[in-house]
């Protein structure tokens, strides 16, 4: 079998909301993946599991099941959303993200994603990790491909 390539493109959108009383930040982060099937037969993208970390703490998880089938020598772009919560022992971040003296509130998040594909009963997992800047003070949307230059570090191979 030939390879199945997973490329993390970047953040497609980050929508922020706050609970003022609980000093909690809610960030809905939509990411984009390109999955390329280099085989001459179809493969099924069985599931995508993702998590987001801030300062080594997991702040959000998501899982998508039975996603799509990718035809021979084809590529599909898949968006997945991870709801994240920055709260409790990290509530000090609320002060930073809502600081009224500055307009830009960048934080660095680690995006982790694992794609499970199956073909002819065989299962394969491909993982990616990528650090991304997100502005926790405002909503942000990106044009396609605009955010693939946001990498703080290269993905682990």
């Amino acid at each position: 079998p030939r390879s199945i390539d997973v490329k993390y493109i970047g953040v497609k959108s980050a929508y922020v909301s706050y609970d003022v009383q609980k000093r909690t930040i809610y960030l809905n982060i939509t990411n984009t993946l390109n999955i390329t099937n280099n085989n001459y037969y179809s493969v099924e993208v069985e599931n995508i599991t993702a998590q987001v970390q801030f300062s080594k703490t997991v702040i959000g998880k998501a899982r998508l099941n039975n996603i799509t089938i990718i035809g021979p020598l084809d590529m599909k772009q898949i968006d997945y959303t991870v709801p994240t919560v920055i709260a409790e022992e990290m509530s000090y971040m609320y002060d930073f993200c809502t600081l009224i003296s500055i307009k830009v509130h960048n934080i660095v998040l680690m995006m982790q994603v694992t794609v499970t594909t199956t073909y002819f009963g065989h299962s394969e997992q491909i993982s990616q990790e990528r650090y991304q800047y997100v502005d926790c003070g405002r909503n942000t949307t990106y044009q396609l491909g605009q955010s693939e230059y946001l990498n703080v570090l290269q993905p682990q191979q």
């Epitope: 003022v20 800047y133 405002r138 949307t141 605009q146």
Partner: antibody
Framework: EVQLQQSGPVLVKPGPSVKISCMAS????????IHWVKQSHGKSLEWIGL????????NYNQNFKGKATLTVDTSSRTAYMELNSLTSEDSAVYYC???????????WGQGTLVTVSE | DIVMTQSPSSLSVSVGEKVTVSCKSS????????????LAWYQQKPGQPPKLLIY???TRESGVPDRFTGSGSGTDFTLTISSVQAEDLAVYYC?????????FGAGTKLELK
């Protein structure tokens, strides 16, 4: 519909101060920054500053420090701007507007015309 | 403070025409972290408050017709109206949304030829 209802036009003499108001309805007052913007007749827009109703925190344009004072009364869901030492240069339409925290200013009041004249 | 310079100051147009308004900032409006440009465009009709059209240099506000397009990066930005309608006759302002104090361009007045 979201509303920022501003007080009516005022005609004042040079010297003293004037206080104009901006009453919020239909949205959670404490969840937004309230901005104040000046527009002199036929001119562009000048950002005066903002106030955060939740804690009364303010951020002023240095050009308006000492000229404008921004306050809020959360019980009446009203933001106020007081302008002091009035001169003809202060004659303008003053807008209050809101932004969801650091998002762009997305909604504006109808404006209050302040005329400073003998 | 960031100075916003708009050109032209006024434009005479016919309905259906394509229009471009330029805006230059004295400092970059790029958030070097997330690579997003923090520039907004507003439309103001006579006797009305400004209305947000575009934010993040290129993202249309909800309900804004797709004939309005924002582009540009760093210090050079453009608002394009692909086919001007009579209701588009107004003054257009660009605004620095990157740092305080928020600053606006002098405006571009769109008039009917």
């Amino acid at each position: 519909e979201v509303q920022l209802q501003q007080s009516g036009p005022v005609l004042v003499k040079p010297g003293p101060s004037v206080k104009i108001s901006c009453m919020a309805s239909v949205f959670t007052f404490n969840d937004y920054y309230i901005h104040w913007v000046k527009q002199s007749h036929g001119k562009s827009l000048e950002w005066i500053g903002l106030v955060y109703p939740y804690n009364g925190g303010t951020n002023y344009n240095q050009n308006f420090k000492g000229k404008a004072t921004l306050t809020v009364d959360t019980s009446s869901r009203t933001a106020y701007m007081e302008l002091n030492s009035l001169t003809s240069e202060d004659s303008a339409v003053y807008y209050c507007a809101r932004s969801y925290f650091s998002n762009p200013i997305g909604y504006w009041g109808q404006g209050t015309l302040v005329t400073v004249s003998e | 403070d960031i100075v916003m310079t708009q050109s032209p100051s006024s434009l005479s147009v016919s309905v259906g025409e394509k229009v471009t308004v330029s805006c230059k900032s004295s400092q970059s409006l790029l958030n070097s972290g997330n690579q997003k440009n923090y520039l907004a465009w507003y439309q103001q009709k006579p006797g009305q408050p400004p209305k947000l059209l575009i934010y993040g240099a290129s993202t249309r506000e909800s309900g804004v017709p797709d004939r309005f397009t924002g582009s540009g990066s760093g210090t050079d930005f453009t608002l394009t109206i692909s086919s001007v309608q009579a209701e588009d006759l107004a003054v257009y302002y660009c605004q620095n949304d990157h740092s305080y104090p928020l600053t606006f361009g002098a405006g571009t007045k769109l008039e009917l030829k």
